[in-house]
């Protein structure tokens, strides 16, 4: 199988991006993305640009960030197209007719491309020290870059299954990402974990007529809790259910409901879990001015999120149209979706070489999530 992506991330509009360190010619890189089920990535304006920059800034690849790295993207100037010195993309264009942001909202050119109207030319994204995007650079298509960026598109997503009593969670996304945490997952993602007593469990995100759901997931948690309480989707004891302000920060496990005191779970007659307290990461997103409580919260369809319209591939789109899903590692709330790519992403590299992303946001807890980039 493919070596796993060095890093991957997703935006709230439904596109996932993966970054790969591999010395390749442009054609081989484009083929690698297609074989993974995606396409060589466009890096247009706005959210797409921020998503790719966040991937780069998550840390250097092989070599430790001592030199500038060049990454293939879906940017080229076709034969018979001229260099246009006054255009932001200098006559180059993205190999996709997807609607994008303003071309003026793009990176600068590290070097001005050669003036020509005859030869086909490709372009790369140059990253200073492998992490800080410097801008575009013209490059002959048959030369080798240090890596490439792929993009994927999915129509429906699975929200992260709540662990309950599960441990050792591992996600395998369909485009070969291995991760310890994916907040939203495309169909084909497999989650494996251990329940109490080291019993292995595995569920897969599948798409159906309604949306996407976790196959073989009985109930709403991977592993049932032995007790009555869950906090942030994990089993908890009552003493751990109070937040910093003394509020009740847990929800009741299946078969229990919130007691009259508002701070404990009691046996439920109906057996339906009831949510309680404030600041609870619940399965129903909190209502906000921009995010009213939806009537149906799960499964998530990309075209339902935040009133966005779905990305529809053009009929003759030379780059495979691929889905966007919210960024790995954020909390499962709609407010997190809203902030996922507006928030500044900071990342550090763990000793094992995995990437830890941290989100500066007041709208959700910013628990660091590790992306495991080891091979299968």
């Amino acid at each position: 199988e493919h070596p796993t992506a060095d890093r991957a991330g997703c935006s709230a509009s439904g596109a996932c991006y993966s970054l790969h360190h591999a010395t390749m010619k442009r054609q081989a890189a484009e083929e690698a993305c297609i074989l993974r089920g995606g396409a060589l990535s466009t890096v247009r304006a706005g959210a797409e640009l921020r998503a790719v920059l966040a991937l780069l800034r998550a840390g250097p690849g092989p070599g430790g960030g001592s030199k500038d790295l060049l990454f293939w993207v879906a940017l080229e100037r076709r034969r018979s197209h001229c260099t246009l010195e006054n255009e932001p993309l200098r006559g180059f264009s993205w190999l996709s007719s997807d609607p994008g942001g303003l071309e003026s909202d793009t990176l600068q050119w590290v070097e001005e491309p050669q003036r020509s109207c005859t030869a086909r030319r490709c372009a790369v994204l140059q990253a200073t020290g492998g992490v800080e995007p410097a801008g575009w650079k013209e490059m002959r298509c048959h030369l080798r870059a240090n890596g490439y960026l792929c993009k994927y598109q999915f129509e429906v997503l699975c929200p992260a299954p709540r662990p309950g009593a599960a441990s050792n969670l591992s996600y395998r996304a369909p485009f070969q990402l291995h991760s310890a945490a994916l907040d939203f997952s495309p169909p084909g993602t497999e989650v494996s974990a251990l329940c109490r007593g080291q019993l292995p469990i595995s569920v897969t995100c599948i798409a159906d007529e309604i949306g996407a759901r976790w196959d073989k997931l009985s109930g709403d948690v991977l592993c049932p809790c032995p007790g009555r309480y869950l906090r942030a989707g994990k089993c908890a004891e009552l003493p751990n259910c109070l937040d910093d302000l003394g509020g009740f920060a847990c929800e009741c496990a299946t078969g229990f409901e919130l007691g009259k005191d508002g701070r404990s779970c009691v046996t439920s007659g109906e057996g339906q879990p009831t949510l309680g307290g404030t600041g609870v990461p619940t399965r129903r997103p909190p209502a906000t001015a921009t995010s009213p409580v939806p009537q149906r919260t799960w499964p998530i369809r990309v075209d339902e999120k935040l009133g966005e319209t779905p990305l529809v591939p053009e009929q003759d789109n030379s780059v495979t149209s691929i889905p966007e899903i919210p960024r790995w590692g954020s909390q499962s709330t709609m407010s997190t979706l809203q902030m996922s790519l507006q928030a500044e992403s900071k990342a550090t590299i763990t000793p094992s070489g995995s990437v830890i992303s941290k989100f500066n946001s007041t709208t959700s807890s910013a628990t660091p999530q590790a992306f495991d980039s080891s091979s299968a």
Epitope: P3, K25, Q27, A28, E31, I34, D316, T320
Partner: antibody, heavy 119, light 108 residues
């Protein structure tokens, strides 16, 4: 001149495994994906999978996962495909093929390796 | 996966006759990634037309290709004896790569 030279005809028993080779010349072996295609007698073409010799990246058609295993040896510019647990359905001609600048069309093909599975 | 359906499966044409065969995709395919191959009995397939309309090296000018989206075609303006073969369309817009079932062209 680009050439892909494949190993010869194979006769195998059901349940056995076979490994065929494809020796490349005339281009930089490590810079291009090598694909494998199956053609049963009198039938059409099926893509099996591909390998990128530069880093041993592989990609398989879901239908052939567990059936075919692709490898490459860069020192000899040779790609290999191993087929396991052979059945009559595996009787076919297998081609190695790679693109070379024509928008991902498979524009160089080996002569094919014929595999016959019979008890 | 994208299914490519070729029609007709078998056709015969007289020498000098104009011939058209079609390839229909189950979902939209970029014209850049739709190709045609010619195969004769006992031989490997040969790239014949790439990216919908570009003739591969050595292919006679009487061949042409066109189409977009889900509908593509290969046309021979004037059939010659050497054109008798099976023609396959092939897409690489989405993985896995897929081929059509082929159109066998015979001389009438």
């Amino acid at each position: 001149e680009v050439q892909l030279q494949q190993s010869g005809t194979v006769l195998a028993r059901p349940g056995a495994s076979v490994k065929m080779s494809c020796k490349a010349s005339g281009y930089t072996f490590t810079s291009y994906w090598m694909h494998w295609v199956k053609q049963r007698p009198g039938q059409g073409l099926e893509w099996i999978g591909a390998i990128y010799p530069g880093n041993s990246d592989t990609s398989y058609n879901q239908k052939f996962k567990g059936k075919a295993k692709l490898t490459a040896v860069t020192s000899t510019s040779t790609a290999y495909m191993e087929l396991s647990s052979l059945t009559n359905e595996d009787s076919a001609v297998f081609y190695c093929t790679h693109y070379y600048g024509s928008d991902y069309a498979m524009d160089y093909w080996g002569q094919g390796t014929s595999v016959t599975v019979s008890s | 996966q994208i299914v490519l359906t070729q029609s007709p499966a078998i056709m015969s044409a007289s020498l000098g006759e104009r011939v058209t065969m079609t390839c229909t995709a189950s979902s939209s395919v970029s014209s850049s990634y739709l190709h045609w191959y010619q195969q004769k009995p006992g031989s490997s397939p040969k790239l014949w037309i790439y990216s919908t309309s570009n003739l591969a090296s050595g292919v006679p000018a009487r061949f042409s290709g066109s189409g977009s989206g889900t509908s593509y075609s290969l046309t021979i303006s004037s059939m010659e004896a050497e054109d008798a073969a099976t023609y396959y369309c092939h897409q690489y817009h989405r993985s896995p790569r897929t081929f059509g079932g082929g159109t066998k062209l015979e001389i009438k």
